[in-house]
């Protein structure tokens, strides 16, 4: 049994880091493998992650971490029984994938304005809370070409757009994702999408 693709990990910079790797053949990850991880810190204890299958030869493990900060560095040991298959390290702050924003809501009761709001996925005491920026994707269910991205570079988790920038009388969907420049993160996953019917009063032709 050998590791074909070494583990690569990303952290949500809060409580979970996800590591993925591939074996050289079909593997029952949860029964055959264990990923041991330990913070390089005074008094830290080793923890064991039981991986799940991610395709025939792929494995994924969700590492639980407390109080993630920039200084943290973890040792990783991948075991198959008594055999050490791979040894490495992981610094969560250098591989951050933020949590996806939630609770995306489209408020259509403001006159001729669409207000989209969503929730910051981090608590106020997490460093990323004040450092997320967002991308909002709006698309038409009827017209695949009607697809647009709005970059939200301010901290407030909301976006205002004129309803007239979208076509009237058809349904749209929106979703939002986040990233943080300070840690050069990847983009988060998209939030679940939300749907609304866009309608507004056309201005009278002269």
């Amino acid at each position: 049994m050998k590791v074909l693709q070494e583990p690569t990990c990303v952290s949500d910079y809060m409580s979970i880091s996800t590591c993925e790797w591939k074996m050289n053949g079909p593997t029952n990850c949860s029964t055959e493998l264990r990923l041991l991880y330990q913070l390089v810190f005074l008094l830290s204890e080793a923890h064991t992650c039981i991986p799940e299958n991610n395709g025939g030869a792929g494995c994924v493990c969700h590492l639980l971490m407390d109080d993630v900060v920039s200084a943290d560095n973890y040792t990783l040991d991948l075991w198959a029984g008594q055999q050490l298959l791979w040894k490495g390290s992981f610094k969560p702050s250098e591989h951050v994938k933020p949590r996806a924003p939630g609770n995306l809501t489209v408020h259509t009761n403001v006159s001729d304005t669409l207000l989209l709001t969503w929730s910051n996925p981090y608590p106020p005491d997490n460093y990323l809370y004040n450092h997320l920026t967002y991308a909002v994707n709006i698309w038409s269910e009827n017209d695949p070409a009607d697809f647009r991205i709005y970059n939200v570079t301010y901290l407030e988790p909301s976006l205002r757009i004129a309803a007239s920038t979208l076509k009237s009388g058809i349904s749209y969907r929106a979703r939002v994702r986040a990233w943080a420049q300070c840690y050069n993160t990847t983009w988060s996953e998209w939030s679940p999408s939300t749907k609304w019917h866009n309608s507004y009063r056309e201005p009278f032709e002269q």
């Epitope: 810190f41 005074l42 008094l43 830290s44 204890e45 900060v69 920039s70 200084a71 943290d72």
Partner: antibody, heavy 116, light 111 residues
Framework: QVQLVQSGAEVKKPGASVKVSCKAS????????MHWARQAPGQGLEWMGI????????SYAQKFQGRVTMTRDTSTSTVYMELSSLRSEDTAVYYC?????????WGKGTLVTVSS | QSVLTQPPSVSAAPGQKVTISCSGG????????VSWYQQLPGTAPKLLIY???KRPSGIPDRFSGSKSGTSATLAITGLQTGDEADYYC????????????FGTGTKLTVL
């Protein structure tokens, strides 16, 4: 919100021991390390040691090895610092502080006076 | 006695900028992260800066930290009378006796 509530002031005779408590609330007690530091009157901060509330393991500053004992009670989310063989130089305010590489939250401090 | 050296005192007028230095070595600041603590008279220390230059929520952006080599600096702009306090730097000893260190402390007086 996070609170670290320390026990009240103590007056001790030289050679005696003192046990200071620090009750934590507002967070997952076993998820954060707890440090102890002290500050003699008019002096700076001095680190004493650290305890991992999860397993109870400890590490102490060399200066206090053999004289200090840090323990925890997970049922009450309380950590304790006991200092033995007290001398007058141990007169100080003793602080518990939550954190790992840096200390996020501090207790208000417990004044321990050692006097004959 | 601390191996992190700070000036015993600094002073400046309200509205001015002041900097406090913290000098260490390769086995501490040079190889670790720096934090700063503010201790107002008669109170417990409070975390002001961590991870060299990050502020906890609630700390105004008048306070900033930086690190270069084996030294670190705390800068306070727009000085206010309420900033009068003792300031301590902190880091880790990364040699064999791995443990936290505090600086000698600096008394800031707002004139």
């Amino acid at each position: 919100q996070v609170q670290l509530v320390q026990s009240g002031a103590e007056v001790k005779k030289p050679g005696a021991s003192v046990k200071v408590s620090c009750k934590a609330s507002g967070y997952a007690f076993t998820s954060y390390y707890m440090h102890w530091a002290r500050q003699a009157p008019g002096q700076g901060l001095e680190w004493m040691g650290i305890i991992n509330p999860s397993g109870g393991s400890t590490s102490y500053a060399q200066k206090f090895q053999g004289r200090v004992t840090m323990t925890r009670d997970t049922s009450t989310s309380t950590v304790y610092m006991e200092l033995s063989s007290l001398r007058s130089e141990d007169t100080a305010v003793y602080y518990c502080a939550r954190g790992k590489w840096w200390l996020y939250n501090w207790g208000k401090g417990t004044l321990v006076t050692v006097s004959s | 006695q601390s191996v992190l050296t700070q000036p015993p005192s600094v002073s400046a007028a309200p509205g001015q900028k002041v900097t406090i230095s913290c000098s260490g070595g390769s086995s501490n600041i040079g190889n670790s992260y720096v934090s700063w603590y503010q201790q107002l008279p008669g109170t417990a220390p409070k975390l002001l800066i961590y991870d060299n230059n990050k502020r906890p929520s609630g700390i105004p952006d008048r306070f900033s930290g930086s690190k270069s080599g084996t030294s670190a600096t705390l800068a306070i702009t727009g000085l206010q009378t309420g900033d009068e306090a003792d300031y301590y730097c902190g880091t880790w000893d990364t040699s064999t006796h791995r443990h936290p260190l505090f600086g000698t402390g600096t008394k800031l007086t707002v004139l």
